[in-house]
């Protein structure tokens, strides 16, 4: 199946490429540079999946969340872990698989009857087929109780950035996540020097907007490493 195209030789601790770079002569598949696929075996099972280091849930797949692989492990070492199914323990919404949310430490179905405060609807609209989603998975969208079919506005509780309206991202605020504005040119941004440092933030900033990247402000180059100010700047 589609979700089983994996790579048992993926280099650990490097972000997996999202697409193959420059195809090799005579090959129909563009493979990532430095990555070799096992002879004749394009499709592999999820068991061969290599851990992907992450700083936040949004860097993982839609059926994963970002966390330390060991209970009480080093907060600085986080990888993408498989989402938790219904009735499994959780600490936040993103830990639960699509179609579920975290309630009282347990993943429960996102049934509107149970979820009144921040209605989360299970949308089974398929990308390609009106009646089904891939492997029966449904898309989860956090919706405000006032407007059923609009994306979350600034301040709305969210699970992921795709729950928020255009120009907003889903970022941590205390111990929940809300829709916050994507950063504009000149605004202060957070540049994480080591993977996993996102997990330490209780007031998380959004990423920089389109065409911008988070870089050291020019007049702060001389400052010490710890006090360097990063702002969103044009590429």
């Amino acid at each position: 199946t589609l979700n089983s195209v994996l790579n048992s030789n993926a280099i650990k601790n490097l972000p997996p490429p999202l697409g193959g770079a420059a195809g090799h002569p005579g090959s129909a598949v563009s493979a990532a540079p430095g990555i070799l696929y096992p002879g004749g075996n394009k499709y592999q099972t999820i068991d061969n999946y290599q851990p992907y280091p992450c700083a936040e849930d949004e860097e993982c797949g839609t059926d994963e969340y970002c966390a330390s692989p060991t209970r009480g492990g080093d907060a600085g070492v986080q990888i993408c872990l498989a989402c938790r199914k219904r009735r499994k323990r959780c600490m936040r919404h993103a830990m639960c698989c699509p179609g579920n949310y975290c309630k009282n430490g347990i993943c429960v179905s996102s049934d509107q009857n149970h979820f009144r405060g921040e209605i989360e609807e299970t949308i089974t609209e398929s990308f390609g087929n009106d009646h089904s989603t891939l492997d029966g998975y449904s898309r989860r969208t956090t919706l405000s109780s006032k407007m059923y079919h609009t994306k979350g506005q600034e301040g709305s509780v969210c699970l992921r950035s795709s729950d928020c309206a255009s120009g907003l991202c889903c970022a941590r605020h205390f111990w929940s996540k809300i829709c916050k504005p994507v950063l504009k040119e000149g605004q202060v941004c957070t540049k994480h020097r080591r993977k996993g440092s996102h997990g330490l933030e209780i007031f998380q900033r959004c990423y920089c907007g389109e065409g911008l990247s988070c870089r050291i402000q020019k007049d702060h180059h001389q400052a010490s490493n710890s006090s360097r100010l990063h702002t969103c700047q044009r590429h």
């Epitope: 589609l2 979700n3 195209v5 950035s161």
Partner: nanobody, 125 residues
Framework: EVQLVESGGGLVQAGDSLRLSCTAS????????VGWFRQAPGKEREFVTA????????DYADSVKGRFTISRNNAENTAYLQMNSLKFEDTAVYYC??????????????????WGQGTQVTVSS
């Protein structure tokens, strides 16, 4: 049937900029990885860039790093490819593609199950 529609292609001079758009039908766009591929005359289709479902992860071919920027707007079911400092070698038909993004992993063209018809980009020197 899913439809991906590319737009924004055209004829430009070397050094100019161009912005391609890829508009998708269907709400599952926000759960998919979106990639741009290109095919120059007489050459194989090659990977250009891709962006994961949330926009938090991007990947670029070495030949376009620092010049091209991929972004997406899930609310509008659209992905963008901003191409700056265009070179003659960038001349190709550019294809937008999408596929499910359930796990963070290495992707190949096989992961991209929906493809657009392509838009021609011609860079004159």
């Amino acid at each position: 049937e899913v439809q991906l529609v590319e737009s924004g292609g055209g004829l430009v001079q070397a050094g100019d900029s161009l912005r391609l758009s890829c508009t998708a039908s269907g709400s599952a766009f926000s759960r998919s990885v979106v990639g741009w591929f290109r095919q120059a005359p007489g050459k194989e289709r090659e990977f250009v860039t891709a962006i994961n479902w949330s926009g938090a992860r991007t990947d670029y071919a070495d030949s376009v790093k620092g010049r091209f920027t991929i972004s997406r707007n899930n609310a509008e079911n659209t992905a963008y490819l901003q191409m700056n400092s265009l070179k003659f070698e960038d001349t190709a038909v550019y294809y937008c593609a999408a596929g499910w993004d359930r796990y963070a992993r290495v992707l190949t063209e096989y992961d991209y199950v929906w493809w657009g018809q392509g838009t021609q980009v011609t860079v004159s020197s």
